[in-house]
């Protein structure tokens, strides 16, 4: 099946201090390689989460990514702050014969708006 990375929401709004879910699904796990989430684009993009076993404070996977047929790579960001505002991209990589892995497809991006905490 042809690989496609889908981020269904163009944007989400979340109150500061709350949690938000950023959805991402794949149509294929091939070619093998990791899936990572970034905020922003280009050289200055920031790694938010990687499905490769590392621990990321405040960010967790929504589905059980250890399922061998898992296609859901959605994440939950907890205790959101204004600094978390920006556009988030779910990115599929193909393993490389040497570092680094090759980016092969990205979702369309989900913009996160952080609202002031209601008083």
């Amino acid at each position: 099946k042809e690989l496609k990375v889908t981020q269904p929401e163009k944007s989400v709004s979340v109150a500061a201090g709350d949690s938000t879910v950023l959805n991402c699904t794949l149509t294929s796990l091939l070619p093998v390689g990791p899936i990572k989430w970034y905020r922003g684009v280009g050289q200055s993009r920031l790694l938010i989460y990687s499905f490769t076993g590392e621990h990321f404070p405040r960010v967790t996977n929504v589905s059980d990514a250890t399922k061998r047929n898992n296609m859901d790579f959605s994440i939950r960001i907890s205790n959101v702050t204004p600094e978390d505002a920006g556009t988030y991209y779910c990115v599929k990589f193909q393993k490389g014969p040497s570092e680094p892995d090759t980016e092969i497809q990205s979702g369309g991006g989900t913009e996160v708006y952080v609202l002031a905490k209601p008083s």
Epitope: L29, L30, P31, V32, P34, F51, T52, G53, D64, A65, T66, K67, R68, N69, K95, S98, E99
Partner: antibody
Framework: DVQLVESGGGVVRPGESLRLSCAAS????????MSWVRQAPGKGLEWLAG????????YYIDSVKGRFTISRDNSKSSLYLRMNSLTAEDTAVYYC???????????WGLGTLVTVSS | ALTQPASVSANPGETVKITCSGG??????YAWYQQKSPGSAPVTVI????ERPSDIPSRFSGSASGSAATLIITGVRVEDEAVYFC???????????FGAGTTLTVL
Amino acid sequence: DVQLVESGGGVVRPGESLRLSCAASGFTFSSHAMSWVRQAPGKGLEWLAGISAGGSDTYYIDSVKGRFTISRDNSKSSLYLRMNSLTAEDTAVYYCARETWNHLFDYWGLGTLVTVSS
Amino acid sequence: ALTQPASVSANPGETVKITCSGGDYYSTYYAWYQQKSPGSAPVTVIHSDDERPSDIPSRFSGSASGSAATLIITGVRVEDEAVYFCGGYDGRTYINTFGAGTTLTVL
């Protein structure tokens, strides 16, 4: 330190059943998929079965499908392998192994010996 | 099935390369497992093609390209004598496989 300790091996007769256990410590057990691998005397390694971190999804090699059942109890940090209708060909050292994110193995137990003999 | 040589030998200090073929690069990740005696617990020396666990000496490295993976031991030592199994995970079939093992003798 990651530790995996298998138990439950022993000598059984052909046709009998056995349940192996693997006690895990030193890591968040509920976050990792796990597998069982065996090694027959004088032979190589053979992967048997794997299970997702939450326990909902299981995977088997064709030769043991329907006869072996992998399961886990995350509240006890334990992995299990139920083996039915055992034959002499099942004689082996059975290892539990922790899976990496891409379903290879990074830590192994010491193994437990299962001998099927009449 | 994964294929690897039955045996290799080297003098201390030499560089050893063990190859493993038979996987599809598009769908397979490789690992290398060291077993010092039959029935003893395997030790993972490389996983994810080229990742070395933190407690494994830096003389062990791995690579993969095409349909083959390679384990490289740079400056082999007597204590590296063991059987080395290559292992693979196939993302197309969801199955793990192993090679038959390579016996490394350090002369």
